[in-house]
């Protein structure tokens, strides 16, 4: 059927219909108002609606939901627990929002939830079990395969007084329920640091986009736990250099494509193992555009293109030479 | 399921061209380097060349005995990979395999066609 | 090149023996940590078909009878015990430098 807007269906004209209705369980074919709905495409659209909280009354066909551009601000425990479930939603978006709290079992009773996308929302307080649903040390394993959470840091005002990464990282972690996840975007999120212990526990990782963030280094970063992951992104940080131990693991994952571009590269005495690994590897894409950012005097320079006697570093001068 | 169907295979003179072709599905033809490697009638097998993937500009690589003579292209619209092979001489004969590098290409070929016979003969 | 020399070439044993086939290359494969050897296994009027990737990976879906060890410029395939299916050529292949090359391959037979 084509999508059917429910603004004509729940109009004012039949108060009964509307209010016998939400007494009941769902009927099959309704349609929340506000949405848009195709039950040929088992899709609900209820997107730029200024909806301040989830329907209640979601068909129970419904495998792709799209509610973005609203202004539902809290996601509480069981925001779409329906009887009977919505067990056929497959694909979740919520992107824009305005959701600045996701509490703990927000997706809970969704068995079928494999696609959750969060971006651009100002999440100042995602729970940890907001996707494990439990505060068990071992949770249930989530559906969860995709998860979608670019740009989702909030103003520097509205943090709370602990990491933003650290936060993200509980949620990621809890009971262990993401142990299934496959794609995780963290784009655009600010991130200083990557906490050390979150890839180990992504075991089925295979996209990871951490873009346009402030990392600095991937010094305490493991990558060797992930035998699946088949692109890394890590444009768009501020990472200076790669040392041998990244570089080693990196290059022997059996299936990883490697994105570096737009990264601030120090092209000094440091940057000697990382020139030789980019001229022969073949895991690095675009590796023919990376380019020196410090030295002034390397500004610029092509990555590839230099030899060991450009990456030299200044002396340390001893302390009776230095001047002021 | 990735598959992998060569064409184009036949008899041909020294001297003359032959254009071979390998069908690609069940995967993102573009994210993949593409190699053909070859073996003449009871030998081993040999590399031939690889065209890299869509992150490292499709550049090609040869080995010395088919440089200058032989050219690896793609078409990522059809999802179709060629050698286009001219200047055959008579030890080029041989079963033509189409493979597909790994992600990590430095792990070499996972996947293979059955291969097409081209034979170089007067 | 690389080039690689497989031995023996023909190997001739009884269905349940274990069978040990040697690669040596002409230098080092490995590349930071990992050596980039495979191993291939290929039947009469069939495609290769890959056992074994950086020297020691078993490719999905492989017996567990196969495995690989070795580093830098020796390698070894191990079938733990042979059976009849198991009769092929076996190629070792590097990619550690362009161009790659293969072994000459070492003729697995049942005796």
């Known amino acids: 059927s084509s999508p059917t807007s429910s603004a004509s269906s729940f109009s004012s004209s039949a108060p009964f219909l509307a209010s016998a209705v939400s007494a009941q369980p769902p009927l099959p074919d309704q349609c929340p108002a506000l949405c848009e709905c195709s039950e040929a495409a088992r899709t609900v659209k209820c997107v730029n609606r200024n909806l301040t909280e989830v329907p209640t009354d979601l068909p129970a066909y419904v495998r792709n939901l799209f509610l973005t551009g609203n202004q539902l601000a809290v996601l509480p425990a069981g925001a779409f627990a329906r009887r009977p479930p919505l067990a056929e939603l497959a694909a979740l978006n919520l992107s824009g929002s305005r959701l600045d709290e996701v509490r703990a079992g927000a997706f809970e009773h969704l068995p079928s939830l494999r696609q959750l996308d969060l971006s651009h929302n100002p999440l100042a307080d995602l729970s940890p079990f907001a996707f494990s649903g439990s505060n068990a040390s071992v949770s249930a394993p989530s559906p969860l395969v995709e998860l979608i959470l670019n740009h989702i840091v909030p103003p520097e005002d509205e943090r709370q007084n602990r990491s933003f990464e650290g936060m993200v990282v509980a949620a990621l972690l809890a009971g262990r329920a993401l142990q299934g996840l496959r794609r995780l975007e963290l784009a655009s999120n600010h991130f200083l640091y990557l906490p050390r212990d979150v890839l180990a526990q992504l075991p089925s990782l295979r996209h990871l986009d951490l873009s346009n963030n402030s990392l600095v280094s991937l010094t305490y970063v493991s990558f060797r736990n992930l035998t699946h992951l088949e692109s890394l992104h890590l444009e768009d940080n501020a990472l200076k250099v790669l040392h041998n131990g990244t570089l080693a693991e990196l290059q022997g994952l059996p299936h990883i494509r490697v994105f570096l571009d737009n990264n601030p590269w120090v092209c000094d005495c440091h940057m000697a193992d990382m020139v030789t690994w980019l001229k022969e590897t073949e895991v690095v894409q675009g590796k023919d555009r990376l380019t020196c950012a410090y030295p002034e005097k390397m500004r610029n320079r092509v990555l590839l293109e230099l030899n060991s006697a450009d990456l030299d570093c200044d002396p340390i001068l001893p302390p009776s030479l230095q001047t002021s | 399921e990735v598959q992998l169907v060569e064409s184009g295979g036949g008899l041909v003179q020294p001297g003359g061209s032959l254009r071979l072709s390998c069908a690609a599905s069940?995967?993102?033809?573009?994210?993949?380097?593409m190699s053909w490697v070859r073996q003449a009638p009871g030998k081993g097998l040999e590399w031939v060349g690889f065209?890299?993937?869509?992150?490292?500009?499709?550049?090609?690589e040869y080995s010395a005995s088919v440089k200058g003579r032989f050219t690896i292209s793609r078409d990522n619209s059809k999802s179709s990979l060629y050698l286009q092979m001219n200047s055959l001489k008579t030890e080029d004969t041989a079963v033509y395999y189409c493979?597909?590098?790994?992600?990590?290409?430095?792990?070499?070929?996972?996947?293979w066609g059955q291969g097409t016979l081209v034979t170089v003969s007067s | 090149e690389i080039v690689l020399t497989q031995s023996p070439g023909t190997l001739s044993l009884s269905p349940g023996e274990r069978a040990t086939l040697s690669c040596r290359a002409s230098?080092?494969?490995?590349?930071?940590?990992?050596?980039?050897l495979q191993w291939y296994q290929q039947k009469p009027g069939q495609a290769p078909r890959l056992l074994i990737y950086?020297?020691?990976n078993v490719e999905s879906g492989i017996p567990d009878r196969f495995s690989g060890s070795g580093s830098g410029t020796d390698f070894t395939l191990t079938i733990s015990r042979l059976e009849p299916e198991d009769i092929a050529v076996y190629f070792c292949?590097?990619?550690?430098?362009?161009?790659?090359?293969f072994g000459g391959g070492t003729k697995v037979e049942i005796k």
């Open positions: 950086g020297a020691s």
């Open positions: 230098e080092s494969v490995e590349f930071y940590g990992t050596s980039f």
């Open positions: 065209i890299r993937n869509k992150g490292n500009g499709y550049t090609t």
């Open positions: 069940g995967f993102t033809f573009t994210d993949y380097y």
């Open positions: 292949q590097q990619s550690r430098k362009v161009p790659s090359t």
């Open positions: 493979a597909r590098y790994r992600g990590n290409p430095h792990y070499a070929m996972d996947y």
